[in-house]
Interface confidence: low
């Protein structure tokens, strides 16, 4: 089966790459606008320039296009702990991220919240904190992992999963983290 193409995609596919079909005259291919600009007026005829205008402050286009309006710049969500990594330019949207020693937890495809990386107190770092993943800790003997924190076995209730981990064990040598590392 041939996949269904939207009207714009059908029209675009008639013209060579970097051009689009004139909406009123399908025998004319107009040159697309560069990133950072938008379509103000279609080209008047074959071989004639498309009228492209630069995006205004607070808007952008990140790729060649024939959009009638630039896209609005994203705003970083302060309530989610986000900070601006780089500001919006005419050809690039705002880049939002987290502070040092924080990671992103995605609530949906486009919405993330910043959380502090776990320090693995009473344990050691197994997997270092990454942009989109918290530190993974390994707990010392006498401690068990609960919500990525090493909690003393004295807080282990019989009904919890920790009972297996908090059985008397051969004493595990507890090292201290080297002061020369972060």
């Amino acid at each position: 089966l041939v996949p269904h193409l939207g009207d714009r995609e059908k029209r675009d596919s008639v013209c060579p790459q970097g051009k689009y079909i004139h909406p009123q005259n399908n025998s004319i291919c107009c040159t697309k606008c560069h990133k950072g600009t938008y379509l103000y007026n279609d080209c008047p005829g074959p071989g004639q320039d498309t009228d492209c205008r630069e995006c205004e402050s607070g808007s952008f286009t990140a790729s060649e296009n024939h959009l009638r309006h630039c896209l609005s710049c994203s705003k970083c969500r302060k309530e989610m702990g986000q900070v601006e990594i780089s500001s919006c330019t005419v050809d690039r949207d705002t880049v939002c991220g987290c502070r040092k020693n924080q990671y992103r937890h995605y609530w949906s495809e486009n919405l993330f919240q910043c959380f502090n990386c776990s320090l693995c107190l009473n344990g050691t770092v197994h997997l270092s904190c990454q942009e989109k993943q918290n530190t993974v800790c390994t707990c010392h003997a006498g401690f068990f992992l609960r919500e990525n924190e090493c909690v003393s076995c004295s807080n282990c209730k019989k009904s919890l999963e920790c009972t297996k981990l908090c059985l008397p064990q051969i004493e595990n040598v507890k090292g201290t983290e080297d002061s020369g590392t972060t």
């Epitope: 050691t124 770092v125 197994h126 390994t138 595990n172 020369g180 972060t182």
Partner: nanobody, 119 residues
């Protein structure tokens, strides 16, 4: 199949240095923290050092702190232990170990390499 192959052991005088290597295969090296443990003649296992998967967190037993340095090269799937200012009490078989990431300390060890510190 997970394989850990240690090398670099040998006879060294007190105060000398050695560098142990551990070539890892059969698993995604960069996803696991790694460590070194040792066993002196007639004694139990002693944990020596551990390093996180990306190498930015290192841990040492008090007995080796300031003298030993653990490091890793994730592009070569290799773990290292640089041992300086060696003492007679460092004489042992040194084992490379792969950590599970769960509570258990480690799930795979190598065959070991013997380090003898003697004049």
């Amino acid at each position: 199949e997970v394989q850990l192959l240690e090398s670099g052991g040998g006879l060294v005088q007190p105060g000398g240095s050695l560098r142990l290597s551990c070539a890892a295969s059969g698993f995604t090296f960069v996803k696991y923290s790694m460590g070194w443990v040792r066993q002196a003649p007639g004694k139990g296992l002693e944990w020596v050092s551990q390093i996180s998967n990306t190498g930015d967190h290192t841990y040492y037993a008090d007995s080796v702190k300031g003298r030993f340095t653990i490091s890793r090269d994730n592009s070569k799937n290799t773990l290292y232990l640089q041992m300086n200012s060696l003492r007679a009490e460092d004489t042992a078989v040194y084992y490379c170990a792969k950590y599970t990431g769960r509570w258990e300390p480690f799930d795979y060890w190598g065959q070991g390499t013997l380090v003898t510190v003697s004049s």
